[in-house]
C-alpha cells in the first residue's frame, strides 16, 4: 500500500509516457490520475516499468474500478495482467476473443497460471460453451488445455469445435475424457471418406466402443500400435484375432513386443491359442485348445 502524499510541483502526469519510469512509487501514486491511466492503458505495456511500479498502477485502477475493470482496460493490461490475482479476475466480464488472446500472449510459453485458468474459466462460462474459435485459441496457447477439463466440462464442447483439435492436444487425456470426446468426433467427421476419416478420428479412439473398432477393421485402416495401446481394454477384449489382424494390418507384428502390456495382455488371455498361432508371432497365453469358453457376462445378461 502506497501512502498518500501530495504530488510535487510540476510532476503531475499529463499523459502516460516514458517519463513515468523515473517516478518513485509514491510519485506515481500521487501524480498519475487513475482516469487518465484507464484511458491510456494501451500505452502502458510499451513503457519499461518495473513490476513494483506496475503494482502502483494496479492499485490506482483498483480504486477506480472496485467492482472490476471494464473490458476496454482489460484488453490493454499487457504485463500488468501478471500482477492480477484470481480474485481480481473473477470480477471481470471478458467477452472478446481478442481480449483473451492479448492476455494469453503475456503468459505465452509458460505453464498455465492460476490467473490464466481463472480468465479462461470466466471467458468460457460467459460464452456458455467452448466454441471452435475459442478452442482454436486455447489449444494454440495451451496444447494440453482440453485434457485439463473434466468430462462434465467437455460435454459442453460442440461437435463442430472438434475440428480445431490436433492430435497433440489429446496427449494427456485420460479414458474418461476420451469417452466424452469420441462421440463428438465421430459426429464431426461422419461425412468424411474412409482413410480421411481414420486420420481425423485416430487420436480420439481411446473412447471408441467395440462395435466401432469392428467396423474400422473392415476398412483397411492399418492402425499403428501406439493407437492400439491407447484403446479401451473393454473395447478390445471382444475383438477376434481376425479383426485385430485386419485392424492393425502390417502393424500386427508389433503385438509381440506388447504382449505383456494392456490391452494386448488381457486380449491374448481371451483368445484361443490356435487362433493366436495363426498370426505366426509366437504369442503365448491364449486359451488352450479343447477348452470350453463360457462368456459369463452373456449368461448373466440372459438370466
Amino acid at each position: 500500500e502506497v501512502e498518500k502524499t501530495a504530488c510535487p510541483s510540476g510532476k503531475k502526469a499529463r499523459e502516460i509516457d516514458e517519463s513515468l519510469i523515473f517516478y518513485k512509487k509514491w510519485e506515481l501514486e500521487a501524480c498519475v490520475d487513475a482516469a487518465l491511466l484507464a484511458t491510456q492503458m494501451d500505452r502502458v505495456n510499451a513503457i519499461p516499468f518495473t513490476y513494483e511500479q506496475l503494482d502502483v498502477l494496479k492499485h490506482k485502477l483498483d480504486e477506480l474500478y472496485p467492482q472490476g475493470y471494464p473490458e476496454s482496460v482489460i484488453q490493454h493490461l499487457g504485463y500488468l495482467f501478471l500482477k492480477m490475482s484470481p480474485e481480481d479476475i473473477r470480477k471481470w466480464n471478458v467477452t472478446s476473443l481478442e481480449t483473451l488472446k492479448a492476455l494469453l500472449e503475456v503468459n505465452k510459453g509458460h505453464e498455465m497460471s492460476p490467473q490464466v485458468a481463472t480468465l479462461i474459466d470466466r471467458f468460457v462460462k460467459g460464452r456458455g460453451q467452448l466454441d471452435k474459435d475459442t478452442l482454436d485459441t486455447l489449444t494454440a496457447f495451451y496444447p494440453g488445455y482440453l485434457c485439463s477439463l473434466s468430462p462434465e466440462e467437455l460435454s459442453s464442447v460442440p461437435p463442430s469445435s472438434i475440428w480445431a483439435v490436433r492430435p497433440q492436444d489429446l496427449d494427456t487425456c485420460d479414458p474418461r475424457q476420451l469417452d466424452v470426446l469420441y462421440p463428438k468426433a465421430r459426429l464431426a467427421f461422419q461425412n468424411m471418406n474412409g482413410s480421411e476419416y481414420f486420420v481425423k478420428i485416430q487420436s480420439f479412439l481411446g473412447g471408441a466402443p467395440t462395435e466401432d473398432l469392428k467396423a474400422l477393421s473392415q476398412q483397411n485402416v492399418s492402425m499403428d500400435l501406439a493407437t492400439f495401446m491407447k484403446l479401451r481394454t473393454d473395447a478390445v477384449l471382444p475383438l477376434t484375432v481376425a479383426e485385430v489382424q485386419k485392424l492393425l494390418g502390417p502393424h500386427v507384428e508389433g503385438l509381440k513386443a506388447e504382449e505383456r502390456h494392456r490391452p494386448v495382455r488381457d486380449w491374448i488371455l481371451r483368445q484361443r491359442q490356435d487362433d493366436l498361432d495363426t498370426l505366426g508371432l509366437g504369442l503365448q497365453g491364449g486359451i488352450p485348445n479343447g477348452y470350453l469358453v463360457l462368456d459369463l457376462s452373456m449368461q448373466e445378461a440372459l438370466s
Epitope: P48, F49, T50, Y51, E52, Y79, L82, K83, H110
Partner: nanobody, 116 residues
Framework: QVQLVESGGGVVQPGGSLRLSCATS????????MGWFRQAPGKGLELVAR???????MYADSVKGRFTISRDNSKNTVYLQMNSLRAEDTAVYYC??????????WGQGTQVTVSS
C-alpha cells in the same frame, strides 16, 4: 536464477568520476532491459538510467549529460559511467531488471559517496 553483482562504488570528490559494473551470472531474459537505480538515505528507490533490449538508453533528468549507461553482451555486464559527480548523487546504486513472469530482480548494491 541469475545473480546480479554490482561493483565499482567508492568515495569520490565532487566533480569526480566512477564507473559502476553490473555482472550477471548468465543470460537474462528481461522485459525491460537493464536499469541502474539508486536509493539515498531515507529516500525511495529511483531509476537513474535504463538500457533497453534494443540498445535504447534512457536517463533521469537529474543525471542527463553526466551519466552514461552501456553494456557488453559478451561479458554479460552493464556499466554506468558517472562523471561530474555531485553530493546529491550519494546513494546505494543497484542494477535490476524485470522478467517476463512478474518479478523484479536486484543486485545487492554498491555504495557511492560524493564528499569533499
Amino acid at each position: 536464477q541469475v545473480q546480479l553483482v554490482e561493483s565499482g562504488g567508492g568515495v569520490v570528490q565532487p566533480g569526480g568520476s566512477l564507473r559502476l559494473s553490473c555482472a550477471t551470472s548468465g543470460t537474462i531474459f528481461s522485459r525491460n532491459g537493464m536499469g541502474w537505480f539508486r536509493q539515498a538515505p531515507g529516500k525511495g528507490l529511483e531509476l537513474v538510467a535504463r538500457i533497453l533490449n534494443d540498445g535504447t538508453t534512457m536517463y533521469a533528468d537529474s543525471v542527463k549529460g553526466r551519466f552514461t549507461i552501456s553494456r557488453d553482451n559478451s561479458k554479460n555486464t552493464v556499466y554506468l559511467q558517472m562523471n561530474s559527480l555531485r553530493a546529491e548523487d550519494t546513494a546505494v546504486y543497484y542494477c535490476g531488471y524485470s522478467d517476463y513472469r512478474g518479478t523484479d530482480y536486484w543486485g545487492q548494491g554498491t555504495q557511492v559517496t560524493v564528499s569533499s
